[in-house]
């Protein structure tokens, strides 16, 4: 059964010239409902009744979920993070097998000197959070671990991580050359095997808000885009006021259709409005009739 | 947690012998690093000797070679230094320390367990 739905409406004009309708419900296609018990299901574009309204999925809203919203929610995180998978041989200690059980009081001690070591390394490097000792075999100590950075998320997080990398190699590569034994003796906290040190990869965190903005969009992902205020990106449509790339429809309201956004233009007591941004307005004549 | 109890010091005339001890409990292991450290009034800490408790290695720092000898008790879990031909230079608090691991360093920062401390005086 087709149900009818009351709905106000504003006269409005597109900028091809036509005039519609454009209520809070969209009426240009008719509204098929169903009864489910004893509620209408009305919801479009994949919405939902949960039996006291539609619940829209993303992009829609409105009580059909039949709009398009100007701006979508995307959460970049707080922080971004890398970690470099790093080796190097220490030579201040004799390995023993005690060293391969990360519970063991050897280990636990090595652990410990290394971590202290590694943060007068890095000290001075603001993104260096910490090392993970991830393995300890023979020869004298070869020390596998991850070196671990983070930083406050900004639109330029990979070239600070980049640079904080390129920073670890230099110190790690000047303290395992500096720090070495004398006579069979080291003078250090810990003495290192300069040609035993190697960068074995570095994974970045990877966060793209553009990638993000375009998933959400689905449909509309050519028409939302990303622009940043205080170091947050924005996923927005022309439609949302107030970025460099909103659409000024002066005289009118914007919406977004799947062919992007566009002016609808208001018609008023004295005046037609036209063009693509509702800039041009005609007079009405004195004795024409509104009805 | 190691516990490092030192025994043993108290004043000796210059050309004079003292043999500390220290004995250690709380390791899990049989195989580890044991140090004597000095520190004379308004200097730095230094090495005196280590030794790695399975015999395989001993360290004596220069200004003791020939006089020190530094040895361990596996038995009795302590660790011993004898001092012979004492000087005036000698004079210090003397620290037993010690590592789980077969430490090669002469560096303080790196021995995580020490005793509270004996002092030598070397005096006429």
């Known amino acids: 059964p087709l149900a009818t739905i009351p709905v106000s409406t504003t006269s409005l004009t597109s900028s091809e010239g036509s005039t519609i309708s454009t209520p809070s419900v969209d009426i240009s296609t008719p509204v098929t409902t169903s009864i489910v018990g004893d509620q209408c299901s009305r919801c479009k574009n994949g919405g939902f009744w949960d039996g006291l309204k539609c619940q829209c999925l993303t992009p829609y809203y409105g009580e059909s979920c039949e709009e398009v919203v100007n701006s979508i929610d995307i959460a970049p995180p707080e922080t971004v993070s890398a970690q470099m998978e790093l080796t190097v041989t220490v030579t201040s200690v004799k390995f023993t097998d005690e060293l391969k059980n990360h519970s063991s009081q050897e280990f636990r001690e090595f652990n410990k000197t290394f971590t202290e070591q590694m943060n007068i390394v890095y000290s001075g490097i603001p993104e260096y959070v910490g090392v993970n000792i991830t393995n300890l075999r023979l020869g004298s100590v070869v020390v596998e671990h991850d070196v671990l950075l983070r930083t406050k998320y900004t639109p330029e997080y990979k070239t600070a991580l980049d640079n904080a990398t390129e920073v670890v190699k230099q110190k790690i590569t000047k303290v395992t050359t500096e720090q070495i034994m004398t006579n069979d003796n080291c003078s250090a906290l810990m003495c290192f095997n300069t040609t035993g040190t190697q960068v074995q990869n570095i994974t970045v965190t990877q966060y793209d808000p553009v990638e993000e903005c375009r998933q959400k969009a689905e449909e509309y992902e050519d028409y939302f885009l990303v622009e940043y205020r205080d170091q947050k990106p924005y996923c927005i449509s022309p439609c949302e006021s107030g970025f460099n790339a909103s659409k000024n429809c002066n005289h009118g309201k914007c919406q977004m259709s799947q062919n992007g956004a566009r002016c609808l233009c208001v018609t008023t007591e004295t005046h037609w409005y036209s063009g693509e941004d509702c800039n041009q307005g005609t007079q009405k004549s004195h004795h024409h009739h509104h009805h | 947690d190691v516990q490092l109890v030192e025994s043993g010091g108290g004043v000796v005339q210059p050309g004079g012998s003292l043999r500390l001890s220290c004995a250690a409990s709380?390791?899990?292991?049989?195989?580890?690093?044991m140090a004597w450290f000095r520190q004379a009034p308004g200097k730095e800490r230094e090495v005196v000797a280590f030794?790695?408790?399975?015999?395989?290695?001993?360290y004596y720092a220069d200004s003791v070679k020939g006089r020190f000898t530094i040895s361990h008790d596996n038995s009795k879990n302590t660790l011993y230094l004898q001092m012979n031909s004492l000087r005036a230079e000698d004079t210090a608090v003397y620290y037993c320390?010690?590592?789980?691991?077969?430490?090669?360093?002469?560096?303080?920062?790196?021995?995580?367990?020490w005793g509270q401390g004996t002092m030598v005086t070397v005096s006429s």
């Open positions: 709380g390791y899990t292991s049989n195989r580890y690093s």
């Open positions: 030794i790695w408790t399975d015999g395989g290695r001993t």
């Open positions: 320390a010690a590592s789980s691991l077969l430490l090669q360093t002469i560096n303080p920062r790196a021995w995580p367990y």
